[in-house]
């Protein structure tokens, strides 16, 4: 008799990443009988919610339901109806909501309450919405990339899944850049983690990991730009800010009230003799780089060594996956290739920033001007953060791998978060059965 396919014995999970600039919904799928195996969970869908991050809904919380509708309806379509009730849904909010909570717990709670009520209206198994800590964000990002790279598997392969995968079992470090924060997470080599706040201990698949992590709140690309503008306007002689981080010919009016809206600019706040100022781009990479460096306080370090702002950072070790905005920005700038040296990246950035704004607009006609205008700053910021902030060098630059997806799953904290909450990463190595259950009879 002919083999007949049995109904797929699969499970699904949904995680919403409520970031500072936008929300994305991820749908994951895995074979039910293999949920403790490493590398079996994969992403089947990403749905980017149209609109800003949830922290921007403070004044219009009633619009949150509509905002989430399209992606939640997409999840309803992708996941078979028979699976809806047992599909967990998690929402994790990151630095944008941490900043809102810092200003007001009441406003942050109100946004989350409305989010929870909206998500509870769907047929899935809603597990709650919460603000995750920076430490969690870093840790789950590290778990995600190492899970997808097969680093937790005890079976050493003779082949590589992805081009930059080394065949050893050394884990990759994780570099995550968002709009409001950035995380660095890795296993240091025989180094004591001098600051308890930055130390994590994991036992995964029978192996112990001592992991360093830190989340730099306000050092995501968008908040770093607000910081830089607030710092530079302090010394401007009038309401014109000649800015090297924007293309020559670029002009934009900024409200001072918007500049001081975020806790990130608090240290630069001052009474200005104007309500608005105009950014006028002059497009100079070197000057932009110098201005960005002023955001990193390297004059004080209470440990054997620091990143910046007195935060402990052990010596860098091994390869790193740089994802989220590290990847999106470098991808746009066409600088993600393994073959591009740090010197070459700097050279390309110098040329890119010097290009006139009118020329840039013509070359990238399909890109929203708001995003397009900020690539010079963002690219320069990435270089400054990696080199001066985290102490990568021209030599160690080749250990940074700009990653968007690994085997079809986005690099980011969401997969690690779901694996943890669904208990799919066992502390001990599961006993492997001689034959896995076949889906055919």
């Amino acid at each position: 008799t002919q083999n007949k396919a049995l109904p797929e014995n699969v499970k699904y999970g949904i995680v919403l990443d409520a970031g500072s600039s936008h929300t994305s919904l991820y749908i994951y799928k895995w074979p039910a009988e293999k949920e403790n195996d490493t590398g079996v969970v994969h992403q089947v869908e990403e749905c980017r919610v149209k609109g800003p991050g949830i922290s921007k809904f403070v004044q219009k919380v009633n619009a949150i339901g509509i905002y989430l509708t399209a992606c939640m309806e997409r999840a309803r379509e992708v996941i078979p109806r028979s699976q809806h009730q047992e599909t967990p849904v998690y929402l994790g909010a990151t630095a944008g909501m941490r900043l809102l909570r810092m200003e007001s717990e009441e406003l942050a709670d109100r946004v989350l309450d409305v989010v929870e009520r909206s998500l509870s209206n769907y047929p899935f198994d809603f597990q709650g919405a919460r603000i995750i800590t920076g430490q969690e964000e870093g840790a789950y990002g590290w778990i995600t990339i190492n899970y997808l790279l097969g680093k937790f598997s005890q079976k050493t392969r003779w082949f590589s899944i992805v081009p930059y995968e080394t065949n050893n079992q050394e884990t990759f470090g994780a570099l995550d850049l968002g709009g409001a924060s950035t995380q660095v997470t890795f296993v240091p080599q025989n180094q004591t983690i001098e600051s308890p706040d930055n130390a994590l201990q994991f036992r995964l698949y029978g192996k112990d990991y001592n992991v360093y992590t830190h989340s730099f709140l306000c050092y995501g690309k968008d908040q770093a730009l607000w910081q830089k503008l607030a710092k530079d306007i302090q010394v401007a002689s009038n309401e014109i800010l000649r800015d090297p981080c924007f293309h020559p010919g670029y002009k934009k009016v900024v409200n001072v009230s918007d500049l001081y809206k975020t806790p990130c600019t608090k240290r630069f706040e001052m009474t200005l003799p104007f309500q608005q100022f105009e950014i006028q781009g002059i497009g100079n990479y070197q000057q932009c780089h110098q201005s960005i460096l002023e955001l990193f306080n390297t004059s004080y370090c209470p440990y054997s060594q620091c990143a910046f702002n007195g935060i402990f950072l052990p010596p860098l070790q091994g390869d790193f996956g740089a994802f989220s905005a590290f990847y999106f920005v470098m991808k746009f700038l066409n600088l993600t290739s393994e073959k591009v040296s740090q010197e070459k990246v700097t050279e390309m950035m110098k040329k890119f920033c010097a290009q006139p704004w009118e020329e840039i607009k013509t070359s990238y006609a399909g890109v929203k001007e708001k995003y397009l205008s900020e690539y010079c700053f963002s690219g320069t910021y990435i270089l400054s953060l990696l080199l001066q902030g985290y102490h990568f060098t021209a030599d160690s630059w080749e250990h940074i791998h700009f990653i968007g997806k690994i085997q079809g799953s986005d690099a980011g904290w969401t997969l690690g978060y779901m694996l943890n909450l669904t208990n799919m990463i066992p502390a001990e190595q599961p006993l492997s059965t001689p034959l896995s259950h076949s889906t055919y009879v």
């Epitope: 919380v61 007001s104 009441e106 406003l107 709670d109 800590t133 706040d197 240290r267």
Partner: antibody, heavy 116, light 111 residues
Framework: EVQLQQSGPELVKPGASVKMSCKAS????????MHWVKQSHGRTLEWIGY????????TFNQKFKGRATLTVNTSSRTAYMELRSLTSEDSAAYYC?????????WGQGTLVTVSA | DIVLTQSPASLAVSLGQRATISCRAS??????????MYWFQQKPGQPPNLLIY???NQGSGVPARFRGSGSGTDFSLNIHPMEADDTAMYFC?????????FGGGTKLEIK
């Protein structure tokens, strides 16, 4: 659990300065602002100001501006308040409190006595 | 500055009865659909303890007999039934705008 541990009582002379501390534990220190509150005669509560531990930026009640300085040491997770040019009016209990707009956690207070 | 007027200044209530303390703000303390009004209990030698936040939400571990209500400029704290342990000073506070301000306090005792 969240705890705020304040430094001990101070007896200071008029015109002098005092610097008190507030050591935080049980949460990410840089994720919340630290406020300072004065309580005189066991009744009147006055908000002095707050500091953003993340970057050291601060906001004050105009009444205390110029006389109070708020600082933090993020590596030791400690907030400090210095009060200068003290008079007998400054004899009070001073509290640190964690929060954005919700003061859910308070230190036990530092009693300052200004006396010649 | 927003002035908070608390009344009465002192109050004596029998065990099991209801205690009502009111707090009036010189201008609305509502913003974005939230009332930035808080109630604290303070016992001698202790720091204030958060009872109510956002005008009507109970703080962590606060007994259900403490109820907050109101919006805009008029707020009240109700304690029912009154227990011996409720003898304390009670303060309202607004954090809608800087400078954050407190009411003058109400001394609650047992009759």
């Amino acid at each position: 659990e969240v705890q705020l541990q304040q430094s001990g009582p101070e007896l200071v002379k008029p015109g002098a300065s005092v610097k008190m501390s507030c050591k935080a534990s049980g949460y990410t220190f840089t994720d919340y602002n630290m406020h300072w509150v004065k309580q005189s005669h066991g009744r009147t509560l006055e908000w002095i100001g707050y500091i953003v531990p993340l970057n050291g930026g601060s906001t004050f009640n105009q009444k205390f501006k110029g006389r109070a300085t708020l600082t933090v040491n993020t590596s030791s997770r400690t907030a400090y308040m210095e009060l200068r040019s003290l008079t007998s009016e400054d004899s009070a209990a001073y509290y640190c409190a964690r929060g954005g707009t919700r003061f859910a956690y308070w230190g036990q207070g530092t009693l300052v006595t200004v006396s010649a | 500055d927003i002035v908070l007027t608390q009344s009465p200044a002192s109050l004596a209530v029998s065990l099991g009865q209801r205690a009502t303390i009111s707090c009036r703000a010189s201008e609305s303390v509502d913003n974005f659909g939230v009332s930035f009004m808080y109630w604290f209990q303070q016992k001698p030698g202790q720091p204030p303890n958060l009872l109510i936040y956002g005008a009507s939400n109970q703080g962590s571990g606060v007994p259900a007999r403490f109820r907050g209500s109101g919006s805009g400029t008029d707020f009240s704290l109700n304690i029912h039934p009154m227990e011996a342990d409720d003898t304390a000073m009670y303060f309202c506070q607004q954090t809608k705008e800087v400078p954050y301000t407190f009411g003058g306090g109400t001394k609650l005792e047992i009759k």
